[in-house]
């Protein structure tokens, strides 16, 4: 059974992940970002189901493509280089989902834009945080 300290740690990690994803979304949606139109042409893949921490496997598998698309945006839109930003997210995701069980992600048939993709994972974080608090 999860202890209060482990629940608190999970909550803090999710909040950190949430902030990172929101920061990316804000950088992309920045009205000064001339790249938004181009960035929206790139396709992302969404999980069929995302209700548990193990489903973060689906986010982890799309982090490389996310970094590629962020590389298109002017670096001044973000506080960190895309590589560092994605590396930070990757570390949190690995800790949150755990490495004990190997979960095979199932993806939805429809693709998503980068904005839809980020919003989906932001909602996921918010949803899990609300169950922990």
């Amino acid at each position: 059974a999860p202890t209060s300290s482990s629940t608190k740690k999970t909550q803090l990690q999710l909040e950190h992940l949430l902030l990172d994803l929101q920061m990316i979304l804000n950088g992309i949606n920045n009205y000064k970002n001339p790249k938004l139109t181009r960035m929206l042409t790139f396709k992302f893949y969404m999980p069929k189901k995302a209700t548990e921490l193990k489903h973060l496997q689906c986010l982890e598998e799309e982090l490389k493509p996310l970094e590629e698309v962020l590389n298109l945006a002017q670096s001044k839109n973000f506080h960190l280089r895309p590589r560092d930003l994605i590396s930070n997210i990757n570390v949190i995701v690995l800790e949150l989902k755990g490495s004990e069980t190997t979960f095979m992600c199932e993806y939805a048939d429809e693709t998503a834009t980068i904005v839809e993709f980020l919003n989906r994972w932001i909602t996921f974080c918010q949803s899990i945080i609300s169950t922990l608090t």
Partner: antibody, heavy 121, light 113 residues
Framework: EIQLQQSGPELRRPGSSVKLSCKAS????????IHWVRHRPEHGLEWIGW????????RYAQKFQSKATLTADTSSNAAYMQLSSLTPEDTATYFC??????????????WGQGTLVTVSS | DIVMTQSPFSLAVSEGEMVTINCKSS????????????LAWYQQKPGQSPKLLIY???TGQSGVPDRFIGSGSGTDFTLTISDVQAEDLADYYC?????????FGAGTKLELK
């Protein structure tokens, strides 16, 4: 028909610089990234970098960071690459290329005919 | 950077033979979301620009003869040319087109016996 037309061969002295051009036709240059690739027979193909002609944003392979400068001119639908501080090792054919479609950055599907740059004293 | 290890360096063949060229990447090129491998094959003849033959490891580019077949997944890929023709004599390169910087294999020279 999509075409990339590159400038003619160049002969340069070591230490000098050269500017190559790549004129696109059959599509609007601002719709896709333009990539540059170097070919040396003994070293094969090497990606130099890309430019987004829409806003001039660039990305370079680390080894070409201080060697190549990519620019674009949307009014003439053309991209350019300047190579500086030339050495005999820069002797190569340089290609510009465009991606297959707009759903990913790569692979390169449309290529210019190449520009041979010879660096010799 | 992802390292692409291509083999063999050169290959001497007779017309009508079948040849295989291998390419190994230092990281997986499989994107789970679409089950596509971001690996392309190019043909380059002397004095010409490279020509895209195969992308996503096995999708033939429009207009490319179907004797060029790409296969493989993850880190191991193969280009097979069945019934080699004289016009196929060229250099062949693999390219990973997943992560910047895109990286090419060292190339394979296909020569006539």
């Amino acid at each position: 028909e999509i075409q990339l037309q590159q400038s003619g061969p160049e002969l340069r002295r070591p230490g000098s610089s050269v500017k190559l051009s790549c004129k696109a036709s059959g599509y609007n240059i601002t719709d896709y990234l333009i990539h540059w690739v170097r070919h040396r027979p003994e070293h094969g193909l090497e990606w130099i970098g890309w430019i987004d002609p829409e806003d001039g944003e660039t990305r370079y392979a680390q080894k070409f960071q201080s060697k190549a400068t990519l620019t674009a001119d949307t009014s003439s639908n053309a991209a350019y690459m300047q190579l500086s501080s030339l050495t005999p090792e820069d002797t190569a054919t340089y290609f510009c290329a465009r991606s297959l479609d707009s759903t990913w950055i790569y692979p390169f599907a449309y290529w210019g005919q190449g520009t041979l740059v010879t660096v010799s004293s | 950077d992802i390292v692409m290890t291509q083999s063999p360096f050169s290959l001497a063949v007779s017309e009508g033979e079948m040849v295989t060229i291998n390419c190994k990447s230092s990281q997986s090129l499989l994107r789970s979301g679409n089950q596509k491998n971001y690996l392309a094959w190019y043909q380059q003849k002397p004095g010409q620009s490279p020509k895209l033959l195969i992308y996503y490891a096995s999708t033939g580019q429009s207009g490319v003869p179907d004797r060029f077949i790409g296969s493989g997944s993850g880190t191991d890929f193969t280009l097979t040319i069945s019934d080699v023709q004289a016009e196929d004599l060229a250099d062949y390169y693999c390219l990973q087109h997943y992560i910047t910087p895109p990286t090419f294999g060292a190339g394979t020279k296909l020569e006539l016996k």
